[in-house]
């Protein structure tokens, strides 16, 4: 198991390609099953705050050295471990640097912000829920609820890459009150703005709000599904959208009930219960395999409500991608 871990090639020490040390040699980690739980543990180990993403390691320059080995095939953390070494690991058997894992953490001690006048959701569970804070001239400010709307929340969620905004009555609890200056109030967003800073607002720092009125926003990763490769929208290989990335679903445990939920969710009538052979005619997918061991009762309105292994955890290849054929 690794004795050291680091992130290489990022804009700061808390993001980059994941590298681990074994017997004095630094190598990479294959991204099989690599997900936000693994990144959370890595960020904790590095003292980098919360996990914010699972980018591909090949995004980071310079790329892994030609002589550098991939040392670990897969890492499976529950998310509660203190170090990657405490997580279940599989030794490498077939991986290349094309599949190097990457990680990005929030890096609390860094003043780096990817958006010059940034926005964040603070003191929440993860980076997609929390108290709205806006960065202006290198200082973080809270935002007053006066004039805040779901449209403004949509802009924040989009700006953070966090999917759609959730309508919530939740207020900042006493422990999550801001201690920073209150930036502004009377935000009037149309919902189409690229950033919160593009929304018209009251004057900077001039308001009568107190921290009881700090704005809390919750976003959720968008979940969507589609059938690809078929003659129409109601037949094909199943793909689901998670973290903004389309990926396939493994056919382990997949059956009639799961078919029915997909057809229902897509408004495609009933499942035609295709044969194994018919299912395979759409070919294998590429990219991520998001779901495995999906179990539905058949009553669900969305596949998202069915039980499944944690996102990205699977022991499948694209030869096992699910295809669904609905009556249309």
């Amino acid at each position: 198991s690794p004795s050291g871990v680091r992130l290489v090639g990022g804009l700061h020490r808390c993001e980059g390609r994941v590298e681990v040390e074994q017997k004095g040699q630094w190598g990479t980690v294959c991204d099989d099953g690599w997900d936000i739980k693994d990144v959370a543990v890595l960020c904790r180990e590095l003292g980098c705050g919360a996990a914010s993403g699972t980018p591909s390691g090949i995004l980071y320059e310079p790329p892994a050295e030609k002589e550098q080995k991939v040392l670990i095939q897969s890492v499976s953390c529950t998310g509660t471990e203190d170090t990657l070494a405490q997580c279940e690991q599989e030794e490498v058997y077939d991986c290349s640097h094309d599949e190097d894992a990457g990680a990005s953490c929030e890096n609390p001690e860094s003043s780096f912000s990817p958006v010059p006048e940034g926005v964040r959701l603070a003191d929440g569970p993860g980076h997609c829920k929390g108290r709205v804070e806006v960065k202006h001239q290198n200082q973080w400010y809270t935002v007053c609820q006066t004039g805040w709307s779901l449209r403004a929340a949509k802009v924040v969620c989009r700006q953070l890459g966090c999917g759609r905004a959730v309508l919530t009555q939740k207020r900042c609890n006493k422990h999550a009150y801001g201690r920073k200056p209150i930036w502004l109030s009377q935000m009037s967003c149309s919902g189409r703005e690229a950033t919160l800073q593009d929304c018209p607002s009251g004057p900077w720092g001039k308001n009568t709000c107190n921290h009881d009125e700090d704005t809390w926003v919750e976003c959720e990763d968008p979940f969507d599904l589609r059938l690809v490769g078929g003659d129409n929208l109601c037949s094909g290989r199943l793909e689901v959208l998670h973290k903004g990335v389309w990926g396939s679903v493994c056919d382990d445990n997949w059956g009639e009930k799961e078919d029915q939920v997909v057809c229902k969710q897509l408004g495609c009538g009933k499942s035609l219960s295709p044969s194994f052979r018919d299912r395979k005619c759409y070919g294998p997918g590429v990219g991520r395999i998001w779901l495995d061991n999906v179990r539905c009762s058949g009553e669900e309105q969305s596949l998202e409500q069915c039980q499944h292994r944690f996102w990205g955890f699977h022991d499948c290849t694209h030869q096992e991608d699910v295809a669904v054929i609905c009556s249309g």
């Epitope: 190598g27 990479t28 892994a64 080995k69 490498v92 290349s96 094309d98």
Partner: antibody, heavy 116, light 111 residues
């Protein structure tokens, strides 16, 4: 969908021979293709692979004697200075999608005979 | 270099019976093992990958098990069509070096 090896023939020791693996209905640009051989009545032996990126890897015994190269629809195996020990059926195979080292799609093979 | 020892080299069994083929690695290889079937005059056919995963279209009568250094291929409810030579294959790729090694093969004769 098929792979087909061609170019197998009778060659003299120390000649150079190139055999070709041609794909029909299979994309060879992105996946990994391997070359193997099987002497008459013997087991399978791995020679080398070429990945989608074009990088090549060889068995220790094959380095320097075999060269693998590719185009979008073909993968070539060049053998220099063959000996009678190299007489075998040569097979190409495509690796399991997403992997580099186990193979689920094979050609029928082409026979290479080395004799003076 | 890693060695794979396959036993037995030949086995005979009746239709409906069960055959067990063993593959032993000279060092631990985790689950990085595949099994192939080869009939005379034909190329190999992938049966099992990652020690126990059944390749698509292969009947569940074929079962792979084991990890580390000891692996087994079990063929139950033997059919005449199962007469073939079976090979285990170790695979390894760590971004730098590749290792693909086959066992010596086991001939299965069905009576």
């Amino acid at each position: 969908q098929s792979l087909k090896e061609s170019g197998g023939r009778l060659v003299k020791p120390d000649e150079t021979l190139t055999i070709t693996c041609t794909a029909s209905g299979i994309d060879l640009t992105s996946g990994t293709v391997g070359w193997f051989r099987q002497a008459p009545g013997k087991g399978l032996e791995w020679i080398g692979i070429i990945r989608g990126s074009g990088s090549t890897y060889y068995a220790t015994w094959a380095k320097g004697r075999f060269t693998i190269s590719k185009t979008s629809t073909t993968v070539d195996l060049k053998l220099t200075s063959p000996t009678t020990e190299d007489t075998a059926t040569y097979l190409c195979a495509r690796a399991f999608p997403g992997y580099n080292t186990f193979f689920n799609f094979w050609g029928q093979g082409t026979l290479v005979t080395i004799s003076s | 270099e890693l060695d794979l020892t396959q036993t037995p080299s030949s086995v005979e069994a009746a239709v409906g019976g069960t055959v067990t083929i063993k593959c032993q690695a000279s060092e631990s290889i985790g689950n990085a093992l595949a099994w192939y079937q080869q009939k005379p005059g034909q190329p190999p056919k992938l049966l099992i990958w990652k020690a126990s995963n059944l390749e698509s279209g292969v009947p569940p009568r074929f079962k792979g098990s084991g990890s580390g250094t000891e692996f087994t291929l079990t063929i139950s409810d033997l059919e005449c069509a199962d007469a073939a030579t079976y090979y285990c294959q170790r695979y390894y790729f760590n971004g730098v070096s590749v290792e693909i090694v086959f066992g010596g093969g086991t001939e299965v004769v069905v009576k």
